[in-house]
Each structure stands twice: as C-alpha cells, then as structure tokens.
C-alpha cells in the first residue's frame, strides 16, 4: 500500500507565439481545478478505461479575474497535494492523466459551469520511495509544469510497497525466520499483513493484501455475514457459501454517482466510473463538448457541438483512444505479408519486402521462375521468394551450369575407391566389404549382413551406384 | 511522389447523381484519410467529406443527406457520389489527402470541372 | 461549425512588400489547429502553413503564420511576383472542415 503524491507547480501559457487568452475575465472570474487519473503499467489501454491505480480530485483554486490588457500569467493554483492512494503494489511503471479544469463563476443559471481547459497524458518508469520527479507538459497553448512520487505507507516499503518492515524488537538481531530489511539495516521484514481492514475474527491471508473469508462470511473485508434464508435481491453472491448476502447499508447505496456513473464498493468507500464526458468523484464534473477541445495529436472533433451530446475524435493514423492520446505501434498489427520488414516512418507506413516479393504490403508473390532458365537440363522450382534450380544428374550450382564431381563427398565407405561415370558414380570396395557405397561388411563365411549381392556380382566387385 | 487524379464525367443532368474516383499514386490508400472537397466557379473551397480505408466516414452535414464517399483498397481508388444534383452543385471537384499531422490537405489532385445542365 | 472570416478579400501590394492577411473564427480554435494554402488560378490549393505556425515541406521562410485562439495571421515578409495568388484558411480543430473565404493578393 501506499499514495502517489502529484504537486502542480504552475499552469499557464507555454513558450513561443501565440499565448492563449486568460481562461477568466472580469465578467466571468473563474477558479482552476485539477484531476489526476491513474493506470498501472505502460500498455495501450483504452482511454475510456476506469482509473484502475486510482484518480483524484484538488480541491478549487483561488478565484481569479483577469486584468483588462494584460497577457494570461501563470494561473492561480489550488492549495496542497493531489493524492491518489493505491491499496496494492506499486507497479513501477504507470500512465497518468491529469486534467486542468475551469469553473467559472458567473452568474450562471443552475450554478457554476465547468469545462476543461487542457489534458496532458503520459507513460512513466517510477519506483516507490524515490525522490520526487519533475516533468513539464504541454497542451495546446498551455503548459502544465508539476512533480510526483510515490510512497509507500509503513509498515510497506521497497520499490513496489510489497516488502513490509517494522522496527526491529531487539536490537542485535530480527526474530526467528526474518531478515533485515535492507537499505533499513534497523529494521525487520514483518509478518504477512493482510488487506487493511481485513476482520481480523471473520478475515485471514495467504498473501499480503488479500482478505479470505471464514465460511459464514463474506465482503471485501469480510464483515458482511452470509444470510442462509434466500433472498431476492442480493447484493452479491457469497465466496463462501451458496447463500445470500444480508443488504446491510453500502457505501453504493442510493448510487452516488451521477449523470449514469455506474458505482463500486472499494474497501473504504466507492469509486463512480463515468460515462463519456463526466468526470470527478461522483460524475458531477460534466459537459466536455468539442469546443473543450478533448482531441488530441491532431484528432478532429466530430459531433458534442452540445453538452448533451457526445463528441468523438477521428484520430490520425498512427493514435487512438477516445481522445487521440495513445500512439499506436502500428507494426504490431503485423501489415507486411510474406515475412516483410515493417517500418512505421510516422506519416505512413512501409514495408521492406523478402526477395521474390512486392507491393506496398508485400502482398505479391512475384513469380520466382519467370525468365530464370536451369541449364543442362535442370528444372526451376519456386519456393520463399527465391527460384531454385534441380539440376539433372552430374550438373550443380545455382542454375545448374557446373558439372558436379559425384566423388567430391568421398561417398564411398571403408576405403572404398570413387569412380566418376556418365551415370553418376562407381565405388570400388575395399576386400571385406560390399554394395553401393561399399557400407555392408561382408561376413567370412561368406554370407552377407545386409541383402545378398545381385546375381552375377560378387564381393569386392565394383559398385555402380545410380 | 505523391499523385491524385480525378476522373469522371464533366457533365451531369439536374437530378441525376454525380460519380467521381480518385486515383492515388505514390501513397498506400490505408495509410491515409482522404478527402473531397469542391469549389464553385468564382467561389470558395468547400469540404464535402473523407473516408479512412476501415470505412469510417465523415461528411459535412450541408450534404450529408446526399453524399456517399467509399474507397477501394485493391485499386488504390476513392469514389465520391453526389446525389440529386442541381445547378447550385456545378464546381471543380478536387480529391486530396489528410496529412497525418491532422485533418488538413497536403496533396491535392489538379481537379475536375462537372457541370450540372440539362 | 466553425465560421472563419478572412480579410481583407482584397490585397493589392507591389512585389517586394509585406502582405499581412487575417483569417478571424467564430470560435476558439483548440490547440492552433489552423492551416493556410495558397491558391493560384487554374491550379489547385498548396498547403502552406499548418498547426497556425508551422511551414510545409518546401515552403519558403517568407512565409510565417502566427495567432492562436479566435485570431490568426498569415505574413508574407516580402512578396515574389509568383506570391500573387488567393489564399485560404482552414480550421481542422471539429467537423465540419471550415474553410475561409479567402484573401486575393494582387499586384498593385
């Protein structure tokens, strides 16, 4: 367990031409928000894909109003950190989304309006307990400059939060079956820790993290028991038994979530997962349109002119995910047939074709034996992109133009002698052995270990071989 | 070298549906999206629609209810069909490819002039 | 849809003077996704600018694009007699595709 910690340092225009407009103006003063959303690993997820490591909400930023005449400053922040906690391991390598959204203050019918200023994403290498990391992106216009760390909550420590150390109990050594924990000499690997929260009468583990349930109970921390009386509404079936659950009060109950999020129970509270253009804890955040400018890398809005519809991205070959955010390998799919070499140059793809092989994916079988004539008789034979010739008796090489020395692989066995002939090759076997490639030791009485000779030839005679 | 080429009748009657294909040369067809647009004698560039080789489209919803755009991947070809034309539809008509950059024009075709008369 | 105005419809300057052309939308274009061409008679559209500042493949540095938001610009630094022609802007941030009306610079 433990929380990755993201600081904002400053949002506000980047470098180079074209500053963007303040966000907020005297008629309409405004206050920023930021949402950070968290995904383990560094794997094309789709976009739409629930925050799986986590995500938060800050809290709102001053209220800001622009000065007449002058350009967008940095804008004002929101006080602290954002902090997402994570109940498991700390994957090492994460995909982070973090959001900068207005609320303007006006005199708005219905209460304040919201809409999102920019979304800057990214894939990062991070290991717990390390220093903190600084990064600066860029969205547009606008660039967002910000730290984050990762660390673990005690008694959790190492790269990944799974190693678990508690002060040592006496001072020389740990107990019985526990290291040190280094880099943390004075401290010792602790016994298994299950799921926080984990009953401790009802609940047990196997694994660090998890909480198993005794039979008669049930739930994530395993304090809802098991009802044995059926039931018609269930709130979710029993690991344990065949029963029902009793309903008992849920942090899901009355689904807090709005505008459609659908909700699910975590261990110490729920989290909503939203529809298409609502975002925050409980989907409240809404009316991303495409005048919020959601696509990304050149993606084109299509639709969402109204909050009450949505928007989609077309995305340029070469990204996808709902917002254009996540660059495709596009060699992955496997476009050049034929064993070609694909190259992904950006503005299109190519493909290196094998030999005997063509077209822009190397679709086309070209026909290896077109043209290719096999001297002396040979005959052409196609075959993975490359012609070759089976050259008559006595002829070798590529197109069959050299005449072969049937004796070059000193074919013939136990001394045997090679004669070349018009017909292939004549072994003459040494005294004591016999047939085509002199290989059958002849036995001393006479008989033969393999088949007898042909009628007419005997042991030690000269062997045609054909 | 990049190339489109525009080809199809320069002379349609009112009522009757316009067909144009383009031809691309120097660029593979399912790499790119492809567009579309026309221009009427005198007058400004409007974008009728484009395709993306998997099918998806996209038109501009002033002629959505009348255009069909598809594409042919074997025969490195797209099609534009305008349906129900009337004299309002007289314009060169220019095939052209997106650039990957984003939905912008980076090559065009040298265009077409079709007619619409009786 | 995005409505892009441009001015003025007519610019009429002598070869080795800067011509400055606007192109003004209806609406905030996200992330400058803004193109320029130019566009000479009897010839198709040249892509000259995208991304509001970025120069095409092949296109001389005189000319620049700048502006973001609802305002851009397009600046020829000096004009070539083969710079007469019409040019365009285009928006590509959400469907539909806009183009501008187009601003004619012609030799004076």
């Known amino acids: 367990a433990g929380v990755f910690e993201l600081q904002i340092h400053s949002f506000g225009p980047g470098p180079g031409p074209g500053a963007p407009r303040s966000p907020c103006s005297a008629r309409l003063p405004c206050r920023l928000f930021f949402r950070v959303c968290l995904k383990p690993g560094l794997s094309e997820e789709a976009a739409e894909s629930p925050c799986a490591l986590g995500a938060a909400l800050s809290a709102r930023g001053p209220v800001y109003t622009e000065q007449p005449g002058a350009p967008a400053p940095d804008l004002p922040l929101p006080d602290g950190l954002l902090q997402v906690p994570f109940r498991d391991a700390w994957p090492g390598t994460f995909s982070f989304i973090i959001e900068t959204w207005r609320e303007e203050l006006g005199d708005q019918i219905g209460g304040p309006a919201w809409s999102l200023l920019a979304r800057v994403a990214g894939r990062r290498r991070l290991a717990a307990g390390g220093p903190w990391a600084r990064d600066i992106q860029r969205a547009g216009a606008w660039e967002l400059r910000f730290s984050y760390r990762a660390r673990c909550e005690p008694p959790a420590v190492g790269t990944a939060c799974t190693r678990l150390c508690r002060p040592r109990s006496a001072p020389s050594r740990c107990g019985p079956g526990l290291r040190p924990c280094a880099p943390l000499e004075d401290e010792c690997e602790a016994p298994l820790v299950c799921r926080a929260g984990c009953s401790p009468e009802h609940g047990f583990c196997e694994q660090p993290g998890e909480c198993r349930c005794l039979e008669g109970w049930t739930g994530p921390l395993c304090t809802v028991p098991v009802s044995t009386s059926s039931c018609l509404s269930p709130r979710g079936p029993s690991s344990a038994t065949t029963g029902c659950l009793v309903p008992g009060p849920g942090p899901c109950d009355g689904n807090p979530c709005a505008n459609g999020g659908s909700c699910s129970e975590t261990p110490r509270s729920f989290e909503c997962t939203c529809p298409r253009g609502f975002y925050g804890l409980r989907c409240e955040v809404s009316g991303v349109t495409c005048a919020d400018g959601p696509c990304f890398n050149g993606g084109l809005c299509v639709g969402g002119a109204d909050p009450d519809s949505a928007y989609i991205c077309h995305c340029p070959p070469g990204f996808q995910g709902s917002n254009c955010e996540k660059r495709v390998d596009r060699c992955s799919l496997q476009p050049c047939r034929n064993g070609g070499l694909c190259l992904d140059l950006g503005h299109a793809l190519r493909c290196r074709c094998r030999a005997g092989f063509a077209g822009p994916r190397c679709e086309h079988d070209l026909d290896d034996c077109a043209g290719r004539a096999c001297a002396n008789g040979g005959t052409c034979v196609e075959g993975g992109g490359a012609h070759r010739c089976s050259c008559a008796l006595g002829f070798g090489g590529r197109d069959c133009r050299e005449r072969a020395d049937p004796c070059a692989a000193r074919p013939c066995a136990h001394g045997g002698r090679c004669y070349a002939h018009f017909s292939g090759l004549v072994c003459a076997c040494a005294p004591g052995y016999m047939g085509a490639r002199c290989e059958f030791p002849v036995h001393p009485d006479g008989a033969s270990a393999l088949p007898a000779a042909p009628p007419g030839l005997r042991p030690g005679d000269p062997q045609r071989y054909l | 070298q990049v190339q489109l080429q525009e080809s199809g009748p320069g002379l349609v009657k009112p009522s009757q549906t316009l067909s144009l294909t383009c031809t691309v040369s120097g660029a593979s067809i399912s790499s790119f999206y492809w567009s579309w647009i026309r221009q009427p004698p005198g007058k400004g560039l409007e974008w009728i629609g484009y395709?993306?080789?998997?099918?998806?489209?996209n038109y501009n919803p002033s002629l959505k209810s009348r255009v069909t755009i598809s594409v042919d991947t074997s025969k490195n070809q797209f099609s534009l069909k305008l349906s129900s034309v009337t004299a309002a539809d007289t314009a060169v008509y220019y095939c052209?490819?997106?650039?990957?950059?984003?939905?912008?024009?980076?090559?065009w075709g040298q265009g077409t002039l079709v007619t619409v008369s009786s | 849809e995005i409505v892009l105005t441009q001015s003025p419809g007519t610019l009429s300057l002598s070869p080795g003077e800067r011509a400055t052309l606007s192109c003004r939308a209806s609406q905030s274009v996200n992330k400058n996704y803004l193109a320029w061409y130019q566009q000479k008679p009897g010839q198709a559209p040249r892509l000259l600018i995208y991304?509001?500042?970025s120069r095409a493949t092949g296109i001389p540095d005189r000319f620049s694009g700048s502006g973001s938001g609802t305002d851009f610009t397009l600046t020829i630094s000096r004009l070539e007699p083969e710079d007469f022609a019409v040019y365009y802007c285009?928006?590509?941030?959400?469907?539909?595709?806009?183009f501008g009306g187009g601003t004619k610079v012609e030799i004076k």
């Open positions: 395709i993306y080789y998997s099918g998806t489209t």
């Open positions: 991304g509001a500042s």
């Open positions: 285009q928006q590509y941030d959400r469907s539909p595709l806009t």
């Open positions: 052209a490819r997106i650039a990957v950059a984003g939905f912008f024009f980076d090559y």
